[in-house]
Amino acid sequence: MMTGTIETTGNISAKKGGSVILQCHLSSTMAQVTQVNWEQHDHSLLAIRNAELGWHIYPAFKDRVAPGPGLGLTLQSLTMNDTGEYFCTYHTYPDGTYRGRIFLEVLESSVAEHSARFQIP
């Protein structure tokens, strides 16, 4: 039985050219996290973090994705094209798979200054 829940940063906005932390947290379960996948809105993999292998950043994102903090992901040098949904998929044993969703809106610099309340501290 899957007892866990995924908490995410929800809907966030960030400044074009800036960076943002995508963060998911799995709670209320003792299941072992074997792998976390980070996917973009078009289902392309940005990165994985495997307990036995470490982090792997996929080639298309190597220059502007950094692992962490924790099991999260830092997306850098944001462009307007980065706007959209992001998914964290937690593969766990014995529970199975948990999935979280984050919506990122990338804003022009002038607009972003008025949207700070949505950003991660």
Epitope: N50, A51, E52, L53, G54, W55, H56, I57, P67
Partner: antibody
């Protein structure tokens, strides 16, 4: 005794193919991620590829991506490396290796099989 | 990819000497570093994993330390069988990468 034995190496011309095998014994092969690591003559170690325990995922070094394919047959306790479009720079001793669980380090290595790419 | 720089590339030492080898990573890798020993014609042998954990069966004269970007392998009292090449390996990121090696030679 935990053991890995590689085979399939040899001399091959550039552009040709070769398939390496690694026979595992003494441990529950199907529970482990398995790796290939190579070593060019007189040089250091280079990680080549890894495959998930159930074969569902594979990752490769950039130097071999698109040319090499790692696979496994858990019913035969055997790991494979299919090497296509071979180049002179692929000349090396190829090792298969098993990790220590949760350590991200390789504690059991085969004796290696030599691949020489030469015209 | 993460680059690992080992120093020195070679060291001449005598039996009983204390030998220190360093490994520097181009980015922080937490404690995901292993050390291997390799003798000519043989496969590498795991000595240390997790930067400081001694692999089962490895003599206690071998020790590892460090975290982040700077790591050290120490042989407290060099024995005749320790003359070999030593490699560090990072496993924070895939692809895993190895240092260039340090050859420990007899003085």
């Amino acid at each position: 005794e935990v053991q890995l034995v590689e085979s399939g190496g040899g001399v091959v011309q550039p552009g040709r193919s070769l398939r390496l095998s690694c026979a595992a014994s003494g441990f529950t092969f199907g529970s482990y991620y398995m790796h290939w690591v190579r070593q060019a003559p007189g040089k250091g170690l280079e990680w080549v590829a890894v495959i998930w325990p159930d074969g569902s995922n594979k990752l490769y070094a950039d130097s071999v991506k698109g040319r090499f394919t790692i696979s496994r047959d858990n019913s035969k306790n055997t790991l494979y490396l299919q090497m296509n479009s071979l180049r002179a720079e692929d000349t090396a001793l190829y090792y298969c290796a098993k990790p220590v669980p949760k350590s991200r380090a390789l504690d059991v290595w085969g004796q290696g099989t030599m691949v020489t790419v030469s015209s | 990819d993460i680059q690992l720089t080992q120093s020195p590339s070679s060291v001449s030492a005598s039996v009983g000497d204390r030998v220190t080898i360093t490994c520097r990573a181009s980015q922080g890798i937490s404690s995901w570093l292993a050390w291997y020993q390799q003798k000519p014609g043989k496969a590498p042998k795991l000595l240390i994993y997790g930067a400081s954990s001694l692999q089962s069966g490895v003599p206690s004269r071998f020790s590892g330390s460090g975290s982040g970007t700077d790591f050290t392998l120490t042989i407290s009292s060099l024995q005749p069988e320790d003359f070999a090449t030593y490699y560090c390996q990072q496993a924070f990121y895939l692809p895993w990468t190895f240092g260039g090696g340090t050859k420990v030679e007899i003085k």
